[in-house]
């Protein structure tokens, strides 16, 4: 039950996560003009990792595409790059979760194939989350780099009189999301590689005993290495039959050994 | 096409309140627009006074900001102004005027005279 | 706030003749997020509001003729009418829109010479 509920935790946990990736990916507010000294401004601009706006006060808005792709920095190029590999892996870690959950039944798929199909979604997850994570914190290293480098030069004098004032730019909403949505996927993949290792039908203990009993005589599998995987000890003891064969409601999805702490 | 009416007293006394009432028709007073007043003193330029926008927020001008204050009514799609403690020098040709793209007033009312006088 | 001063206070042309009021800021209306200038300039004739000519410095407002032109960026910009026309007679002002609060130029007036 235990593995069940840890299993379909990390899927939920994770699709929150990409779907959370994916929002802060399209989102235009990576970066937002920075309102150190005017809370109230005419024009407010904010960029994202495919367009910029401006936000007029009067309501209007307009947003214009990076049009060029050799004309972008290499910084932004990666930061797409990380976050689109991200996306992908997760979509892809979605997918073969689906098929991996416990609860869902997919002709006699094996325990041995979910429980490696839970470990390679897991281990995607955790990619999917540290690349999202690693791609909002170039982008956020990038904008305190650009925000220091304006900030010595924030007025630059023309002619005396006249000044420019440069537009600083500050973390945007996208940052935070993706920061979070990277983190619940990265959890969500150690919680899928967890819920493996209580999937593994741990066949050389199975073997060692079983094959050894006689025809009529049962024998049990101890509980130690299941204990030693950190799922507690075994309180639900299956008789395991000559040959190994299974029993028949180990061969339905009802509740298994491997349901209970 | 938007457009505003101007309605108010002509008259009023120095130290008193002005209040103006703006009409809007031709468009919602709650779509993605600011709404302005302007003012025209007799013969002079044109002084921006402050603005409610589509959200509700006002900004105002700092040289008036202790005396003015915008306000709308959605339900009669009508915006307003109030000006305390008017003097002579508040005697002007009062506009509402629409801004959009470019913060730029898009469309202006006829523009209503207050003369401040006792 | 941002001081906008135009020159000249006024200006006598001739009828199909060109037309140039320039306008000045105290400080840039140049929006580096989308490479826009926050300048507008509107005409106003006796006895009406004023009516909006040119936004963003150079876009003109649709209805206008395109005799008149706007050009400029950061601090110094010009209205051209290339051709004056006898409507064209009026008080012409220049606005920035990029920092609160809103300016006006002191305006400048056409006439016919």
């Known amino acids: 039950m235990a593995v069940t509920a840890c299993q379909g935790l990390g899927f939920v946990v994770s699709l929150i996560g990409i779907a959370g990736i994916i929002a802060a990916t399209c989102m235009d507010q990576w970066s937002t003009q920075d309102l150190y000294n005017n809370p109230v401004t005419a024009v407010f601009n904010y960029q994202g990792l495919w367009r910029s706006c401006v936000r007029e006060s009067s309501g209007f808005t307009e947003c214009r595409g990076y049009f060029t792709l050799l004309g972008l920095p290499a910084m932004l190029q990666a930061v797409r790059a990380l976050m689109i590999v991200g996306i992908v892996l997760g979509a892809i870690g979605l997918l073969v979760s689906i098929f991996a959950l416990k609860c869902i039944r997919i002709g006699s798929m094996e325990d041995s194939a979910k429980a490696n199909m839970t470990l390679t979604s897991g281990i995607m997850f955790i990619v999917s989350g540290l690349c999202a994570i690693a791609g909002v914190s170039v982008f956020a290293n990038m904008l305190v780099t650009n925000f220091w480098m304006s900030t010595a030069n924030m007025y630059t004098g023309m002619g005396g009189m006249v000044q420019t004032v440069q537009t600083r730019y500050t973390f945007g909403a996208a940052l935070f999301v993706g920061w979070v949505a990277g983190g619940l996927t990265l959890i969500g993949g150690v919680m899928m590689c967890i819920a493996c290792r209580g999937l593994a039908p741990e066949e050389t203990n199975y073997k060692a005993v079983s094959y050894h009993a006689s025809g009529h005589s049962v024998a049990y599998k101890p509980g130690g290495f299941k204990a030693s995987t950190g799922f507690g000890s075994n309180t639900k003891n299956k008789k395991i039959y000559d040959g190994g064969a299974r029993t028949e409601d180990e061969v339905q999805s009802y509740p298994s050994k491997h349901d209970y702490v | 096409q938007v457009q505003l009416q101007e309605s108010g007293p002509g008259l009023v006394k120095p130290s008193e309140t002005l209040s103006l009432t703006c009409t809007v028709s031709g468009g919602s007073i709650s779509s993605n627009y600011a709404w302005n007043w302007i003012r025209q003193p007799p013969g002079k330029g044109l002084e921006w006074m402050g603005y409610?926008?589509?959200?509700?927020?006002?900004n105002y001008n700092p040289s008036l900001k202790s005396r003015i204050t915008i306000s709308r009514d959605t339900s009669k799609n009508q915006f307003s102004l109030k000006l305390s403690s008017v003097t002579a020098a508040d005697t002007a040709v009062y506009y509402c005027a629409t801004s959009y793209y470019g913060n730029s007033f898009i469309y202006w009312g006829q523009g209503t005279l207050v003369t401040v006088s006792s | 706030d941002i001081v906008m001063t135009q020159s000249p206070d006024s200006l006598a042309v001739s009828l199909g003749e060109r037309a140039t009021i320039n306008c000045k800021s105290s400080?840039?209306?140049?929006?580096?997020?989308?490479?826009?200038?926050?300048l507008a300039w509107y005409q106003q004739k006796p006895g009406q509001p004023p009516k909006l000519l040119i936004y963003w410095a150079s876009t003109r407002e649709s209805g206008v003729p395109d005799r008149f032109s706007g050009s400029g960026s950061g601090t110094d910009f010009t209205l051209t009418i290339s051709s004056l026309q006898a409507e064209d007679v009026a008080v012409y002002y220049c606005?920035?829109?990029?920092?609160?609060?809103?300016?006006f130029g002191q305006g400048t007036k056409v006439e016919i010479k």
């Open positions: 606005q920035q829109a990029y920092s609160f609060p809103w300016t």
């Open positions: 400080q840039s209306l140049l929006n580096s997020g989308n490479q826009k200038n926050y």
């Open positions: 409610i926008n589509y959200s509700g927020n006002t």
